[in-house]
């Protein structure tokens, strides 16, 4: 048994970071193979992960973690049975997916405006709580072709668009994303869409 | 919120015994290495005895000054660090703290006083 | 064991401006990137509280007005501006290797 695809990892900076790799055939991850995480901390405690299985021979892993720190760095040792497979080291805040903004909600009752507001996905008393900025995508289900994304370099979870930028009478959705520019983030999962109908009144035409 | 609750301080006599708890909660207890410190009456801080979580085989460390003494124990199952005091000396009157270890000793008890007098 | 010294053992600053204070440990306390020296607040009645970990790392919920730096032997808390709550004793700790030791402690007043 090998590795044929070192593990990766990302940390979601608050509790889970999730390890990925590839063995080099079929493998049954949760009951042949054990990670195993460190702070390399003095004294620091050890952590097991069962991984699950990831498509035939990938194998993913969600370690828990009760906070994260930019200090932080992680032995990991990749084990079957007895055999060390993999040894590394992780480093949380260099490989930074933050979680998925959540509760997009698009409110149309503000006269031809629509206001869009999503939560954000860290408490205040994480780090990236003041630091992530967001993409708003917004596209018609009826046109492919219709599909748009807005960019929020502000820290306020909310988007303003004029009713009228979007077409009449017609259904679209939204979903939201967020990163990090502080630790170089990549790019968060989308939230989930909502959907609306995009209704309002056309202006009276000038003779 | 992180909460650690000390108890079981009390007067005693030269050579007698004392069991201190504390009762941890607000967070994964089992994953922690704990430690018990010390502070005598207008003194500093002495760090007296460290366990480890079970991924460590509760492996423990001991102050020279108490070896042979005191004995640490832990039930994960019930987030209880526990401190059995024997043959206790005048030079252990002191208030004793339940410490959280991670990356330093980052969470503290309010303590239990302990005083060994005749 | 790692003894490690406070300098000085009292000190009164005056409101808004700078405390230092030092310790000095008795070999290197920095090992693989770290530096494993912490720094505690404690108030009267009260238990010590974590304000620097790892030398300079802020503590979450400690005001930006706390800083630690050094390296090896040599370590710095520094405080400003100083407030008035600010009043306490300060404390040293390595966790360098066992047995994990204190410093004798820096009593800051406020003039």
């Known amino acids: 048994m090998k590795v044929l695809q070192e593990p990766t990892c990302v940390s979601d900076y608050m509790s889970i970071s999730t390890c990925e790799w590839k063995m080099n055939g079929p493998t049954n991850c949760s009951t042949e193979l054990r990670l195993l995480y460190q702070l390399v901390f003095l004294l620091s405690e050890a952590h097991t992960c069962i991984p699950e299985n990831n498509g035939g021979a990938g194998c993913v892993c969600h370690l828990l973690m009760d906070d994260v720190v930019s200090a932080d760095n992680y032995t990991l040792d990749l084990w079957a049975g007895q055999q060390l497979l993999w040894k590394g080291s992780f480093k949380p805040s260099e490989h930074v997916k933050p979680r998925a903004p959540g509760n997009l909600t698009v409110h149309t009752n503000v006269s031809d405006t629509l206001l869009l507001t999503w939560s954000n996905p860290y408490p205040p008393d994480n780090y990236l709580y003041n630091h992530l900025t967001y993409a708003v995508n917004i596209w018609s289900e009826n046109d492919p072709a219709d599909f748009r994304i807005y960019n929020v370099t502000y820290l306020e979870p909310s988007l303003r668009i004029a009713a009228s930028t979007l077409k009449s009478g017609i259904s679209y959705r939204a979903r939201v994303r967020a990163w990090a520019q502080c630790y170089n983030t990549t790019w968060s999962e989308w939230s989930p869409s909502t959907k609306w109908h995009n209704s309002y009144r056309e202006p009276f035409e000038q003779h | 919120e992180v909460q650690l609750v000390e108890s079981g301080g009390g007067l005693v006599r030269p050579k007698g015994s004392l069991k201190l708890s504390c009762a941890a909660s607000g967070f994964s207890f089992n994953t922690y290495a704990m430690n018990w410190v010390r502070q005598a009456p207008g003194k500093g801080l002495e760090w007296i005895v460290w366990?480890?979580?079970?991924?460590?085989?509760?492996?423990?460390y001991y102050a020279d000054s108490v070896k042979d003494r005191f004995t640490i124990s832990r039930d994960d199952s019930e987030s209880m660090l526990y401190l059995q005091m024997n043959n206790l000396k005048t030079e252990d009157t002191a208030m004793y703290y339940c410490?959280?270890?991670?990356?330093?000793?980052?969470?503290w008890g309010q303590g239990t006083s302990v005083t060994v007098s005749s | 064991d790692i003894v490690l010294t406070q300098s000085p053992a009292s000190l009164a600053v005056s409101l808004g401006q700078r405390a230092t204070i030092s310790c000095r440990a008795s070999?290197?306390?920095?090992?693989?990137?770290?530096?494993?020296m912490h720094w505690y607040q404690q108030k009267p009645g009260q238990p010590p509280k974590l304000l620097i970990y790892l030398a300079s790392n802020l503590q979450s919920g400690v005001p930006a007005r706390f800083s630690g730096s050094g390296s090896g032997t040599d370590f710095t808390l520094n405080i400003h501006p100083v407030e008035e709550e600010d009043a306490a004793t300060y404390y040293c700790?390595?966790?360098?290797?066992?047995?994990?030791?204190f410093g004798g402690g820096t009593k800051l007043e406020i003039k």
């Open positions: 070999k290197s306390v920095s090992a693989s990137g770290y530096s494993y």
């Open positions: 700790q390595h966790s360098r290797e066992l047995p994990p030791t």
């Open positions: 410490v959280r270890h991670l990356r330093a000793m980052d969470y």
């Open positions: 366990i480890r979580s079970k991924s460590h085989n509760y492996a423990t």
